[in-house]
Every structure is written in C-alpha cells, then in structure tokens.
Interface confidence: medium
C-alpha cells in the first residue's frame, strides 16, 4: 500500500486558535484501517474522517479545529497491511502562540529594605521571547531575555511586582506578585538599622 | 439512492432482550459509520454511539457505555443495537445515521447525512 | 458527564430574526452541528463545523461560533422554519458525542 500524509509539509506551522486539517492518502487497498498517531500513540477520538476516492484509494483526515500547544507534536498516519504495520512519513506540527509563563513572579515576605530577587521566564514558539518588568503600573526594566532575574534592593511599603512576555505573536502578563513588609520585632537590629530609609527604592538591576 | 432500512419492534416486558437492525442499500456498507441515536417520546436526541466503517472500533456516550451494544454485519451491510436487558426507560425511538460523507469538511460521527426513519421500541410490563 | 446546554423554546414573528445558542465547555476545541426535527420526522442537518451549511438549506441559516457559545441564526425565519433545533458536538477527549437538549423555535 502507498501511504503518505497530503497536504501539509514535513513541518507545519500553525497559530495557537487555528483549525488544522491533516490529509493522509492511502493508495493499493480495498478497506484500508487507517490510524492517527501523535508521539507514538494512536489518537483515539472522533475528530477523523475517511473518504473513499476511488476503491482502492483513500484519504484520512484528522481534524483540529483550534490548535493550542498541547496539540503540537509529529503526527503519522499508519495502515495495517497483511500483519504488518505500515507509516507514512511523519509531519511536526509546531504551534505558536504568545508567550506561555513556565516561572511566574511569587509573593514573598521580605524585612524592610532587604534586597529580594523575582523569577520570571516564558517560552513560545516563536523565539525569541524577551521580559519587561512592572512594579504596579510602572515598568522598571526590560525588555531583556527569558528568563529573567529581577534583583530589588528593598521596599518599605507592600509592593506589587509583574512581569510581561513579548514575542512576535503578542504579549503575555504574568500573575502579580505582593511582596510584603515583614514584620520586625522592636528592638531588633533590622529595625533599628533601616527605620530611617523611607525611600530606599533604588532603581533594580534587570539582568538575566 | 442511499437507503436506511429500520427493523420494527414489538411491545416488550422489562429484562427481555432485544436487538434492533439497520439495513444499508444504495453505497458501500464498509465506506461509512453508522452511529445509533435515542429519542425518548417528546424528549430531545440522545447520541448513543457509533460503529467504525469496518466494525473494529466502537464508542459509546456515558449512559449508554454497558447497557447496549452495536455490531454490524459487513455481508449483510446491517448495523445492529442489542440489550440484554430491557428497562422501561428504554421506551424510545431508535434511530440509525450513517456517518461522514464524500463531501468536503465533515468529521466522523458529526457529519449525519442520512437517518433512518427509527424504530419505536415500547418497554411496559 | 459533558453536556450541552440550550434554552427550551424561543419564539420570533415571521421575517424576525431567530437566534438559539448552545453553550458547551468543549466548544472552543470542538465543532457545533445544527440538527432541525419536523414534527414526527426523522432529524436533518442544517449546519456543519459551526458555520458550514448543508447542501440544499436556505440562506437564511447560518451558525457561528465565539468562545464557548455556539448560535443559528435564521435570518428572516419563515413559517416553515417552526421546528426543534438541537446543537451536537463532540466532548472534551473526542471519544463520545453530546446532543444539546434541544430549542423549539416558533414562529408565530
């Protein structure tokens, strides 16, 4: 049997929401059993249609209608064959879409005007992905690489910390971090070392 | 001219059995599906499951999964809906669908181009 | 379970413009299907892939699909249109279909 899959290039390139239709012809068999295969397993859902063009040609399609980054990955058709298995040449579908946050900023609990860092990193594709930072509604730094390491010198107030993820798809906005004032018992030596620095807030270092 | 062709049912007691046959005529039985479909009287579609144009894979919906069973009979071109057991909230009419197409876009079971004209299968003790 | 939802009856004057929605979690992966059902007949598609019509339907049906909300629309409904309309689509994983419970449309 001829087996290849039709209509989508060895590599196929699709936007995150998009539909997707995979075509996969099989020539030299009467009822072939054609079967979707995604990274080694077969894809068992109702998504498939099979035309019969001709009695001895076929065409199966695997239909997505909105892609999102789960649905990436190498697709093939296969047909069994007189007991034996036969694959078609396999297509990688790449979806991309806007950043997507595998670290977010986390709340944390800091001394007055002890120096705290942030985390913040995001993937696509598409690459490159580059961050811009915001403290409240004021950006502090960026855009720089992901990931990113945001290295505050210290607050004396509860302060909310963001950071945005751009690549050529659009932006991505992470959850917002508080980070809060702890509280320093009195007489300690943090407190009386650091009572008198009401606007430490020194302009953060924005490195990767 | 595709054809659907319903068996008809009689009345039946709760805990009979029960099999219920779609005769296909007009195109190539194995080229399609066929999905079975319940309607209860006054009540609105219920999708029961489906049979793969081949007979090698079936689904079923959730409340169906363990109460019927589909089959079909490739040299009879006729899909089948059995119960071992019936129950009177099975009353209902039946109806068999032959799935997908050779027109562009549709997707298996979705696309339902042709409906039996169903079965009424009455369950009274 | 996964399940679609539709409002019972909705009622337009003729050359009106009827709207019935299906609502259901899965709609943003999965297509929406319009099935209409004559009094004592047997169901036929209206609507394929959320905005595709069948083959031989009226212009004035038309679907579309937003978020998870799926609508028929029948511009300019007619008498003939008087019927019940039920949405269909596939659950979450693929591996069963769901028929909403069904909207009767009159057109008074």
């Known amino acids: 049997a001829g087996l290849k899959l039709m209509g989508a290039p060895v590599k196929l390139t699709v936007s995150q929401g998009q539909p997707v239709k995979l075509n996969c012809s099989v020539e030299g068999m009467e009822e072939p059993d054609i079967q979707w295969v995604k990274d080694g397993a077969v894809v068992q859902n109702l998504d498939q249609l099979y035309i019969p063009v001709s009695e001895q040609h076929w065409i199966g399609f695997l239909s997505l209608k909105s892609v999102e980054r789960s649905d990436a990955g190498r697709y093939w058709c296969q047909v069994e064959d007189g007991g034996e298995t036969e694959i078609s040449q396999p297509v990688w579908l790449t979806v991309e879409g806007v950043p997507f946050f595998t670290v977010e900023p986390k709340d944390l609990a800091v001394p007055p005007n002890a120096p705290f860092q942030l985390s913040c990193e995001a993937v696509g594709p598409p690459e490159p992905v580059t961050i811009v930072w915001w403290r409240g509604t004021t950006k502090i730094g960026g855009p720089a690489p992901s990931p990113s390491v945001l290295n505050v010198t210290g607050v004396t107030q509860s302060t909310m910390f963001s950071c945005e993820a751009h690549n050529l798809k659009g932006l991505a906005s992470s959850r917002t971090a508080t980070v809060h004032l702890q509280l320093v018992p009195r007489g300690s030596s943090a407190h009386h070392h650091h009572h008198h620095h009401h606007s430490a807030w020194s302009h953060p270092q924005f490195e990767k | 001219e595709v054809q659907l062709v319903q068996s008809g049912a009689d009345v039946k007691k709760p805990g009979a059995s029960l099999t219920i046959s779609c005769q296909a005529s007009g195109y190539t039985f194995t080229d399609y599906w066929i999905s079975w479909v319940r309607q209860k009287p006054g009540k609105g579609l219920e999708w029961m499951g489906a049979?793969?144009?081949?007979?090698?894979?079936?689904y079923y919906g959730p409340s169906f999964q363990g109460h019927v069973t589909i089959s079909a009979d490739r040299s009879t071109a006729t899909a089948y809906l059995q119960w071992r057991s019936l129950e009177a909230s099975d009353t209902a009419m039946y109806y068999c669908v032959r799935s997908g197409g050779l027109t562009s876009g549709g997707t298996i079971p979705e696309y339902y181009q042709h409906w039996g004209p169903g079965t009424l299968v009455p369950v009274s003790s | 379970s996964y399940e679609l939802t539709q409002p019972p009856s909705v009622s337009v004057s003729p050359g009106q413009t009827a709207r019935i929605t299906c609502s259901g979690d899965a709609l943003p992966k999965k297509y929406a299907y319009w099935y209409q059902q004559k009094s004592g007949q047997a169901p036929v598609l209206v609507i394929y892939?959320?905005?595709k019509r069948v083959s031989g339907i009226p212009e004035r049906f038309s679907g579309s699909s937003s978020g998870t909300m799926a609508t028929l629309t029948i511009s300019g409904a007619q008498v003939e249109d008087e019927a019940d309309y039920y949405c269909y689509s596939l659950a979450v994983d693929g591996n069963y279909g769901v028929f909403g419970g069904g909207t009767k449309l009159t057109v008074l």
């Open positions: 892939e959320d905005k």
């Open positions: 049979i793969s144009r081949n007979g090698s894979t079936t």
